[in-house]
Every structure is written in C-alpha cells, then in structure tokens.
Interface confidence: low
C-alpha cells in the first residue's frame, strides 16, 4: 500500500514547537512525501518560499537513507488560485511552456514526480485539466526515454460531489495519473451553521449534512463508479480537525454554532486545529464517538472539534483495504504530533504511524 504524506513549507513559520522543517520528517514513515507547494511564474514551475531550494534539499536527503522513498513536488494549492491555473491550462502555448519546464526543475532538485493541486478546475476547465494531465504524462514518458526513471504524476482531487461533477473527467485523467489523492476531508464547515464532522467515514444517522454525499464512503464509491481504478485511488486522512464555536448549550452533532472555533496556539487559523493542538485541547474535554460515522469529536466550554484519532484512522485504513484502494494520503505530516511531545505517547507522528501500522497489518 502507498502512504502518501504531504509536507507544507509554511509550517516552518509556526512558532516554537509548531515549527516543522523537512529534516524533522521520518524517512521510513511514508512511501511518498509530497512537498507543498510550488509556484508557477511566467508559465514556468518555480519556487514559492525564499528558502524552498534549501528545504527541497533537506527533504530529498531523506532518500539517502531510504532509497525506496519517493518525493513529489505539488504545484498549486489554495493560495495559487484557480484562475491562474485556468489561464495556463487553457492556452496551448502557456500549457506547453509549463509542461516543458517541469522535468528539468524536478530533476535539478531531486524530486521523483509532480503532484497537481489545482483547487479547483471550473466547469469550463474540465477539458483543459484533462489535456494538461495527458500532455504532462506524455512529456514525462518522452523525457524518460534515455533510460531515466520516469517521473511520477499524481493529482489531488476534491471529494465533493459537486466539484467532482464539474471539474473532473475521472475516467480520462485516471488513465494518465500514477495515483490520485482524494481529499476526503473538509466535508463540513462553519458555513453549514451547525456542528458536524469534516471527515466522516460514513454518513451516520447522526449526520447533520443536508445531503448524503458529504462522507468518505460516498466520495470513494462515486470516484470508483466514475471510472477511477481502485489501484490508483489514495484516500485522504486528515491530521487536523475542524472546530466550531457553539451558539447554545447544545453540544451534539448538528448543534447550532456562531462561527468557527478559536484559532490554535500554533496554527493560528480559526476553525482549524492540528492534531498536536487537539491533544492539548483534549485535556479536560469531553470526547464522543459518532458511531455511524466512525470518527470522534470533543467539546470543552463553547468549543467543538471534529477530528481523527488512532481508532478512527484504523477504521479508515480497514475501509480502504476492504475497497482495495492503493493506499492512504495524509494531510499533513506537520499537523501530526511530529515532535511526539503533545499527545503523551512518546511517539512521533502518532496518527501517521497508526495509519502505517494499519496498512501493514494483515
């Protein structure tokens, strides 16, 4: 099984114990590590952070001691903007320039492949996204002719049914991608006006979502139905939680909220907590399991957080094995307890390790 793990370059800027550099990563934990994110400037793939080249080096030296580890560079992301990707992908010359720029950049910096994180193609971009993937793969095949190992090509896709329908020609893009990471999280947010888990495995009877699409099981099943081969589908598991501020004394699933939860001490983003911040939160909190959804949530005062723990990630891994998927994807290593100092287990990356162990279990 693949264990595809994202590392985010901006995690270096978190203060104190939240700051994470690639040299803190475990070289034997994941089969693939994806560095997020690269930029595109003047239609060429490019660095994003001022010290990306240094960090690329840190990451890729992990392979010195684990030659089986594959590293990929992810291009795009939330801050890149869908419009910029659209302009490049829809223009034949821009697309060609971008595609040509990728292999030398990856080779120079020691990466084994490219991950496309176009979040998200619009309805009009659907065909262009397919073309981009098809042509990128053709370039990778051509570039590898002189006996080089062919560069890998993957994509991170939304798990939302509406986005899947409008953005992706699943059957076609699946032919050209080495694997597909389906982002089976962020199904529920403060916009719903109620509490709810952002990454349920199933639609439980407790689910407050107005649809039956907002769960991992549906998204995976839908992707398979649309023609994604199980052997290429990698299922996303979050090492972060989504939090809400309760608006009343109700604390269950579907309770009214006044907005996102208060920012974490290190991640500093309202409505989001890293797993290591959740471990802090759990001291003195009340933990509940949403049985049908097979995930936990915790409450403390007027704060509510839906997250994944070692038990829920094991359920998710069992599920992906049952559906004979290619493996698991983790967003993100730097949101797990990467120091092993927050969650009281004396274990670095407890969630990712639980995923790895469950994948290896017979």
């Amino acid at each position: 099984y693949k264990l595809v793990c994202y590392y985010t370059s901006w995690s270096q800027y978190r203060e104190g114990d939240g700051s994470c550099f690639p040299d803190a990563l475990d070289r034997f934990l994941c089969t693939h590590i994806i560095y997020s994110f690269a930029n595109i400037s003047n239609d060429h793939i490019d660095t994003w952070e001022w010290n990306d080249v240094t960090l690329y080096g840190m990451l890729n030296t992990l392979k010195n001691r684990n030659p089986n580890l594959k590293t990929l560079l992810s291009v795009g992301g939330w801050n890149f903007g869908s419009q910029r990707f659209s302009k490049i992908a829809s223009n034949t010359q821009s697309r060609r320039t971008f595609i040509k720029s990728v292999p030398p950049f990856l080779r120079t910096h020691g990466f084994d492949g490219l991950d496309l994180a176009w979040l998200y193609p619009g309805r009009r971009d659907k065909q262009h996204f397919t073309t981009l993937i098809k042509e990128m793969k053709a370039e990778f095949i051509k570039e590898a002719q002189p006996g080089k190992k062919q560069l890998l090509l993957s994509a991170a896709l939304s798990a939302g049914k509406v986005t899947i329908d409008s953005s992706y020609d699943i059957a076609k893009i699946s032919q050209h991608l080495d694997f597909i990471s389906i982002m089976t999280y962020d199904f529920h947010g403060a916009w719903r006006g109620t509490t709810g888990h952002h990454s349920p495995l199933f639609r439980g009877q407790e689910d407050a979502s107005p649809d039956r699409f907002s769960n991992t099981d549906y998204a995976v099943g839908y992707m398979l139905r649309l023609g994604a081969p199980a052997s290429k589908l990698v299922m996303g598991i979050p090492t972060f939680g989504r939090s809400f501020t309760l608006a009343s004394s109700e604390t269950g699933v579907g309770a009214p909220i006044s907005g996102p939860g208060i920012p974490g001490r290190f991640t500093k983003e309202a409505g989001t907590l890293a797993y290591y911040e959740i471990c802090d939160f759990l001291r003195g909190a009340t933990v509940h399991r949403i049985l049908g959804q097979q995930v936990p949530y915790a409450t403390k005062g007027n704060q509510w957080v839906g997250y994944d723990d070692q038990e829920s990630v094991k359920s998710k891994v069992q599920y992906l094995k049952d559906r004979q998927l290619a493996g698991a994807m983790v967003w993100a290593l730097d949101l797990d307890d990467f120091q092993g100092s927050f969650c009281g287990q004396d274990l670095r990356f407890p969630l990712t390790n639980a995923i790895k162990d469950a994948l290896a279990a017979t």
Partner: antibody, heavy 119, light 109 residues
C-alpha cells in the same frame, strides 16, 4: 412515511407487467435510493434493482438486466417494468427506500404486491 | 458477483436462550452489511446496519459483529416475538450490489 406497491396480479408466461411504488409523507428527493426486492413463495429475498434519485443512476442484479427496468416517473412514484415473464418470476415484489445510513440500507418497506405468472 | 452464505438455514432455541447466525461474504465488503428480520406475511424489518449498529427502535438484545468477511448476528434472552427469518445483506453504494443471504429461520420453543 410509507411506500406502497401496486400493479401486481396474474400474468401470462412471456407477458409483461409494470409495478408502481408510491411514496406517502415524503418525495423521492436526491437523498434516497429506491429499490425493488422480490421473494418467491417460501423462498428468500432477492434484490432486483435500485435507482438513485440524485442523478438517476440505475443498478441491477446481473440476472435482471435486460428484462427489468427501474424508472422514476414522478416525485412520488418509481416503477419496475418487467418483460418476458416466466413462472420463476412468481413472487411478492417489495419496494423499499434506503436510510440515511452508510450504504444502501433498506429501512422503509412496502407491504409487497404479488405477481403470479401462470397460464 | 458477491455471494453471502448464511448458516444455519434453521435454528431452534428456547425462550431466554441465545441464537447465533453467521453470514460469510465471498468478497471483502468491510462493514457494509445489514441484518433484517422478516415474519410471515410481512416485509423485512431493518435490525442492524454497518455490521454492528442497532437501527432505531430495535432491542439491544440484537447484536451484530464482524471478523474479516464473517458477520454474526447474536440474539440473546430469546423471546417468542423473535421467531422469524433473518437475512443479511451487503450494502455497498457507489458500486451498488445488494446481495442477500439465503436466510435463517429461528424457531423459539
């Protein structure tokens, strides 16, 4: 909330019949799969087909493809068209709606309608 | 195609006793299994979903469990009203295939 089947009765071998499932107290919104299941006298349950109202997708048991067609005909009715009927198709036909649980879990069943294929 | 093999076909037990019904899946379906109870002349009634979760209004005397591809329905403190035929059903969606097991008749003495 309830569902009720109609349209059953006696039919000649090689004949055709259309069964209707009518909902009361709810409409076939995008949240539901509607399914047909049959049960021959003294035998077990046998799944025939489902329709997913969200996108109109249809699903059939391999043996039912070609002879049975499931359709949504209105916001409160689903039909099952059956052709080339034989004595082996004699059964009580149930219409069932799925629950908002994981997978297609049938928690709302009609009382059934009996179809007898005989000359 | 998925095949669910239910055993035994029939079982007899006394009031207050315990009955165990097995359902073996031919392929891996994870927790995608439901159990139904059916009495003569009536449609089936949902008991258990996601292998082990009790449907609303169902007595806690009914318990579902799973070990690999083998699923078990246990009825404890048997009552006369439990006399019925019990069916397992696989519940995948996304790739819908709703196989039923052959059924197990429970006779209560």
């Amino acid at each position: 909330q309830s569902v009720k089947e109609s349209g059953g009765g006696l039919v000649q071998p090689e004949g055709s019949l259309t069964l209707t499932c009518t909902a009361s107290g709810f409409s076939f919104s995008s949240s539901y799969y509607m399914c047909w299941v049959r049960q021959a006298p003294g035998k077990g349950l046998e799944w025939i087909a489902c329709i997913y109202n969200g996108d109109g997708s249809t699903y059939y048991a391999s043996w039912a493809k070609g002879r049975f067609t499931i359709s949504k005909t209105s916001s409160t009715t689903v039909t099952l068209q059956m052709t080339s009927l034989t004595a082996a198709d004699t059964a009580t036909y149930f219409c069932a709606r799925d629950a908002d649980y994981a997978g297609v879990v049938l928690n709302l069943w009609g009382p059934g309608t009996l179809v007898t294929v005989s000359s | 195609a998925q095949v669910l093999t239910q055993t035994p076909a029939s079982v007899e037990a006394a009031v207050g006793g315990t009955v165990t019904i097995k359902c073996q899946a031919s392929e891996s379906i994870g927790n995608a299994l439901a159990w139904y109870q059916q009495k003569p002349g009536q449609p089936p009634k949902l008991l258990i979903y996601v292998a082990s979760y009790l449907a609303s209004g169902v007595s806690s005397r009914f318990k579902g469990s799973r070990s690999g591809t083998e699923y078990t329905l246990t009825i404890s403190d048997l009552e006369c009203v439990d006399a019925a035929t019990y069916y397992c059903q696989c519940t995948w969606y996304g790739n819908v295939y709703l196989a039923f097991g052959g059924g197990t008749e429970v006779v209560v003495k």
